[in-house]
Interface confidence: medium
């Protein structure tokens, strides 16, 4: 004969676990039903009655099968360093992404917990490694024959233009100036830009100061895996 299907609540066999979408209630000592995503436990189970579930209220959610007494509050509105990419529903939290020019400074499995502005490389320094979703820009000094005259989180060092006759030699922060109006060879005009990262986050936070320029405050300051790169600057 096939085994009888137990209906919740039921006492599990010694050494066995409750089935999928059930949990063991230590007070009742019974296997009881979990509540579905979008719901929460309004009344916990007893030895004779199963869990009573209720829908999450506005601005609250549960994403998983659960037996929590209250739904989780959706995150605060996305702050000035974010854009909303997913609205709050009964089954999912609001999701915000770090806006262009920012990266996720502290991430967890649920998404980003803290956005921070991308480091800007000052004149004489260019971007050695662009920012990503979870890492800051790395700056490097412009090598001989190259320059950067901008304060930017995207500009790389560019070669000096080649002059027939040099009026002012170039340096790390300035292009060469030619005496003739038409140099022998020059790079395309305008700075070279690198793409900005976009990172997912589900947490409202305030902008955090850059490690290299932040004044002393009562809050924690972000410390990256390595010290701030030389040549970085604030806004």
């Amino acid at each position: 004969l096939p085994a009888q299907v137990a209906f919740t609540p039921y006492a599990p066999e010694p050494g066995s676990t409750c089935r999928l979408r059930e949990y063991y209630d230590q007070t009742a000592q019974m296997c009881c039903s979990k509540c579905s995503p979008g719901q929460h436990a309004k009344v916990f189970c007893t030895k004779t009655s199963d869990t009573v579930c209720d829908s999450c209220e506005d601005s609250t959610y549960t994403q998983l099968w659960n037996w929590v007494p209250e739904c989780l509050s959706c995150g605060s509105r996305c702050s000035s360093d974010q854009v909303e990419t997913q609205a709050c529903t009964r089954e999912q939290n609001r999701i915000c992404t770090c806006r262009p020019g920012w990266y996720c400074a502290l991430s967890k499995q649920e998404g980003c917990r803290l956005c921070a502005p991308l480091r800007k490389c000052r004149p004489g320094f260019g971007v050695a490694r662009p920012g990503t979703e979870t890492s800051d820009v790395v700056c490097k000094p412009c090598a001989p024959g190259t320059f950067s005259n901008t304060t930017s989180s995207t500009d790389i060092c560019r070669p000096h233009q080649i002059c027939n006759v040099v009026a002012i030699p170039g340096n790390a922060s300035m292009d060469a100036v030619c005496t003739s109006t038409s140099p022998t060879r020059s790079m395309a005009p305008g700075a070279v830009h690198l793409p900005q990262p976009v990172s997912t986050r589900s947490q409202h936070t305030q902008p955090t100061p850059e490690p290299s320029t932040a004044p002393s405050t009562s809050f924690l300051l972000p410390m990256g895996p390595s010290p701030p790169a030389e040549g970085s600057t604030g806004d």
Epitope: E70, S73, A105, Q109, R113, T208
Partner: antibody
Framework: QSVEESGGRLVTPGTPLTLTCTVS????????MGWVRQAPGKGLEWIGI?????NTYYATWAKGRFTISRTSTTVDLRITSPTTEDTATYFC??????????????WGQGTLVTVSS | DVVMTQTPSSVSEPVGGTVTIKCQAS??????LAWYQQKPGQPPKLLMY???NLASGVSSRLKGSRSGTDYTLTISGVQCDDAATYFC????????????FGGGTEVVVK
């Protein structure tokens, strides 16, 4: 899933010490990890956190005194210049986000550091 | 930094009684508060997160609540196994990531 600390020992003041937290059953690229310490007979004191992206944050008092780093399966806590006040059991714990909320849901047994001359 | 003030530091309650532990945050932490239980020689164990949500496998005799910046853990029908030290922990996310623990409450079961 488990977390285990190692490296705790008796050191003299000023001698740098590195504690190692070895994790198994989950990926450090998905989870943040925190370090917490507890002096004998005292309460819990948060030291800092390393996020799944590798970024670190420290308690104000711990900044400059501790450095947190990681490999693919371990998280290290370096005590740069221990003093006798750093004598404590050091715990490594997984720092999870429940939506907008945070908690330390998986702890190691701790490793004892004794600083004495 | 945010400071968590936990009271009382010690409480004694007979089996079957009710224990109430309070934590007050010095700043608005928006329910980002967890509760832990620690027994001698053991690491802390997560009991509750988001002020009122039970962690997996934790008895529903425990209840968390919030009133403004005051947070309360209530243990009803106290059992001998509840004898331990309880800590609250908040996470404050502003211009950085700050975690603070309360001083702890020792629960003695008579």
């Amino acid at each position: 899933q488990s977390v285990e600390e190692s490296g705790g020992r008796l050191v003299t003041p000023g001698t740098p010490l590195t504690l190692t937290c070895t994790v198994s059953g989950f990926s450090l690229s998905s989870y943040a990890m925190g370090w917490v310490r507890q002096a004998p007979g005292k309460g819990l004191e948060w030291i800092g956190i390393i996020g799944s992206g590798g970024n670190t944050y420290y308690a104000t008092w711990a900044k400059g005194r501790f450095t947190i780093s990681r490999t693919s399966t371990t998280v290290d806590l370096r005590i740069t210049s221990p003093t006798t006040e750093d004598t404590a059991t050091y715990f490594c714990a997984r720092d999870v986000g429940y939506g907008d909320y945070d908690a330390l849901d998986l702890w190691g047994q701790g490793t004892l550091v004794t600083v004495s001359s | 930094d945010v400071v968590m003030t936990q009271t009382p530091s010690s409480v004694s309650e007979p089996v079957g009684g009710t224990v109430t532990i309070k934590c007050q945050a010095s700043e608005e932490i928006s329910s980002n508060l967890a509760w832990y239980q620690q027994k001698p020689g053991q690491p802390p164990k997560l009991l509750m997160y988001a002020a009122s949500n039970l962690a997996s496998g934790v008895s529903s005799r425990l209840k968390g609540s919030r009133s403004g910046t005051d947070y309360t853990l209530t243990i009803s029908g106290v059992q001998c196994d509840d004898a331990a030290t309880y800590f609250c922990q908040c996470t404050y996310i502003g211009s950085g990531y700050v975690v603070a623990f309360g001083g702890g409450t020792e629960v003695v079961v008579k």
